[in-house]
Interface confidence: low
């Protein structure tokens, strides 16, 4: 059988190392060799490459080498197939080595910010040693900023010959770092180079790009000073390298700039003391080159009524998210705030807040909370300068068994009956929400019975019990994830009523 | 006062793990970055790597990497550096030191601890 | 890794004289080096940053100078108390580097 004809004749011309065309089918049933025909000089040379050796036998590459590589050229290649049976030849195939030629990567030596020159890089590099001098060069670069995995390109051409280039890259985030790679091919090649080594640089730093802030309203105090605890970080959409040195608040009554205060901190929180008036505050952040934008909260009366537009809330998992969603009655209100915090005994130690614009949900990450923590979230509807009144809900991201069972014990101890009271197990404890309790009781060598009621109940009346019996009882705790047992205790029911009993003294 | 106060000298066997503190008072460290370096017996400075308190971006120098893990707690303003599989290469005075990343420089500079690696 | 080549690496100067230490880059740094002291059993002590800018409260007997590759830290009138061990730095790309530290001592 004669071998099939060699197609998809593809070759490629690697500057100044060799010219390789490969071909279809890369294996033969048979053994084949394999005679690629070349024309070169613009068709006054001719010669052969051939796969006839042990070592390329069988093998649909084949490479011509130098001194013979001539450029600029046009080539024609033909493939010859020859098997014990015969000959196969391809169709001819024409080659423009300006149009397949592949030269090696630039390298980048320098990715610089220009004193001056805002949101911009200078990417330096040098041409590749072996890019025909002469020649146009077409480039891609690709960046990115050093935490996403989303490339942008842009492409350019450079006719100049010296070998150190420059590239300006505008138009990027202040105090950013990106991440940098190039390529080039010459102006007419379909083949690009491989892509640089990525290097690194950092856009000029730019006075803050602005806050976010936020409240939390504290009851009054004796005295009447209402604490209010500000927070402020960077807004959203600022650069991840920015750095404040510090903050500037300033605050006054509403209608009485006289009054107004000012606090410089480091810190991103500051707790003001407010008389019962409104209030404005401001605050702006500021580096070594000047100020942010002023980010503006007003701080109602104390006896201000507000609004409310949140008629329900519910809190959902996804595999790895947590999603709350709230219903509303008020279309013109598009931004909220989100507070969430752990619920615990003690005064939470992180509080954490967001902006919610132009939608009714809110979506966190499970990693970012605490497995077997309840976590407190409320949503605060904004509209223009007044906060409305916040609708609440808990959730926990994970659930398991409570750490500690209900602390039990038994009063009001009867003949056939006794009530058993329960303590509600500390928060920090719970690891889920409560969902119902189950008393195990248990007469001496008898059978057990269990009795189980709603998560609001601590106290349970027990009947139909056997006079002067001891019984063994402990209450369960559960959560979506199990239960817990309480300590066990032991009573036992009395022979006679002591009300009974006392009447019968009495005659 | 403006100061980093790091925790005392150690004493570790090879193959062991060292965590060094650093406490920074006078200065919230959400607002720097936090660098490590050390220094061997009659030898140079090298620098290990750079934690921003702010979010826990760490780097860290190539000859370190895998080896030392930079933490920072906010709440106490404390930085801390982890060197595990502890050799006699790793004896050594460890500094952290406050960078102000508008400033470009270490202004503040911990006491040092020293750490022995001896079987 | 950019390696940084101080010299000399020691100096023995007499009060009142000048005192000249440079340090070399393998690559430019554009000016991003900073020049430290450390006194035996002390940390390093900022003098100069960016190459030329010195830190507050540095005398100006202190001076730095230098771009791209070569910088050089200039000490005049030398008083007793400049004896220490003097390293420069790049902050221009990660790992950063010191030079191996230049020991002044007074004569």
């Known amino acids: 059988v004669l071998p099939a004809k060699p197609e998809n004749i593809s070759c490629i011309f690697y500057y100044e190392e060799n010219f390789t065309c490969t071909w279809s089918p890369e294996k033969e049933a048979s053994y084949t060799w394999y005679k690629v025909k070349r024309t070169y000089s613009y068709g006054y040379k001719s010669d052969i490459c051939s796969t006839d050796n042990s070592t390329r036998g069988n093998h649909a590459s084949c490479s011509f080498l130098p001194p013979t590589i001539t450029n600029p050229d046009n080539y024609t290649i033909q493939v010859e197939a020859q098997n014990a049976d015969g000959i196969m030849k391809s169709d001819i195939t024409y080659w423009n080595l300006d149009a397949i030629m592949k030269i090696e990567p630039p390298e980048i030596f320098s990715v610089k910010s220009v004193l001056g020159i805002k949101r911009m890089l200078q990417i330096k590099w040098i041409r590749p040693v072996l890019a025909p001098h002469s020649s146009t060069l077409k480039y891609t670069l690709r960046f990115r900023t050093i935490n996403s995995a989303y490339w942008m390109e842009v492409n350019f051409t450079k006719e100049d010959i010296d070998r150190d280039e420059t590239y300006n890259l505008t138009e990027l985030q202040a105090f950013t770092e990106y991440v940098m790679t190039l390529r080039c091919a010459p102006a007419e090649s379909m083949f690009w180079s491989g892509w640089s080594q990525e290097k690194v640089g950092t856009t000029e730093e730019e006075a803050p790009y602005g806050l976010d802030l936020w409240r939390v309203l504290k009851p009054a105090m004796v005295d009447g000073r209402r604490p209010v605890q500000l927070m402020w970080k960077k807004a959203t959409g600022a650069p991840v390298l920015e750095k404040a040195l510090g903050y500037n608040i300033w605050y006054f009554p509403e209608n009485n700039t006289n009054l107004t205060e000012t606090v410089n901190t480091t810190n991103q929180t500051h707790e003001l003391y407010l008389g019962g008036k409104t209030y404005w505050v401001y605050v702006v952040s500021y580096n070594s080159l000047g100020e942010s934008p002023v980010a503006t909260l007003r701080i109602p009366a104390l006896n201000e009524k507000t609004f409310q537009c949140i008629e329900a809330m519910q809190a959902c998992l996804t595999q790895d998210q947590l999603v709350v969603e709230w219903q509303s009655s008020a279309p013109e209100v598009d931004t909220w705030m989100v507070e969430w915090f752990p619920d615990v005994d003690s005064e939470p130690s992180s509080f954490s807040w967001e902006s919610v614009s132009q939608a009714r949900n809110w979506t966190i990450q499970k990693d970012e909370l605490k497995p077997l923590w309840c976590y407190n979230i409320s949503v605060y509807p904004v509209l223009r300068d007044r906060v409305g009144q916040p609708y609440s809900t808990q959730a926990y991201v994970q659930e398991g068994i409570p750490s500690a069972g209900p602390v039990t014990q038994a009063d009001s101890i009867g003949v056939k009956t006794v009530t058993i009271t329960w303590k509600e197990i500390p928060k920090s404890k719970r690891n889920g929400f409560i969902k119902n309790y189950t008393i195990f009781y248990q007469a001496e060598d008898g059978k057990e019975f269990s009795k189980t009621v709603n998560s609001n109940i601590l106290q349970y009346r027990l009947e139909s019990l056997t006079r002067r019996t001891s019984y063994s009882l402990q209450v369960m705790a559960s959560t979506n994830a199990g239960g817990t047992n309480g300590t066990k205790i032991n009573f036992k029911t009395l022979s006679i009523s002591h009300h009974h009993h006392h009447h019968h003294h009495h005659h | 006062e403006v100061q980093l106060v790091q925790s005392g000298a150690e004493v570790k066997k090879p193959g062991a793990s060292v965590k060094v503190s650093c406490t920074a008072s006078g200065f919230n460290i959400k607002n720097t970055f936090i660098h490590w370096v050390r220094q061997a017996p009659g030898a140079g400075l090298d620098w290990i790597g750079r934690?921003?308190?702010?979010?826990?971006?760490?780097k860290y120098a190539p000859k370190f990497q895998g080896r030392a893990t930079l933490t920072a707690d906010t709440s106490t303003n404390t930085a801390y550096m982890q060197l595990s599989s502890l050799r006699a290469g790793d004896i050594a005075v460890y500094y952290c030191a406050r960078y102000y990343y508008v400033s470009s420089y270490f202004d503040v500079w911990g006491q040092g601890t020293l750490v022995t690696v001896s079987s | 890794d950019i390696v940084m080549t101080q010299t000399p690496l020691s100096l023995s100067v007499s009060p009142g004289e000048t005192a000249s230490i440079s340090c070399k880059a393998s690559?430019?740094?554009?000016?991003?080096v900073t020049w430290f002291r450390q006194k035996p059993g002390q940390s390093p002590q900022l003098l100069i940053y960016s190459a030329s800018n010195r830190y507050t409260g540095v005398p100006d007997r202190f001076s730095g100078s230098g771009s791209g590759t070569d910088f050089t830290l200039r000490i005049s009138t030398v008083e007793a108390d400049d004896t220490g061990v003097y390293y420069c730095q790049q902050d221009y790309s990660s790992p950063w580097t010191f030079g191996q530290g230049t020991k002044l001592e007074i004569k």
């Open positions: 934690i921003d308190p702010a979010n826990g971006n760490t």
């Open positions: 690559q430019s740094v554009t000016n991003d």
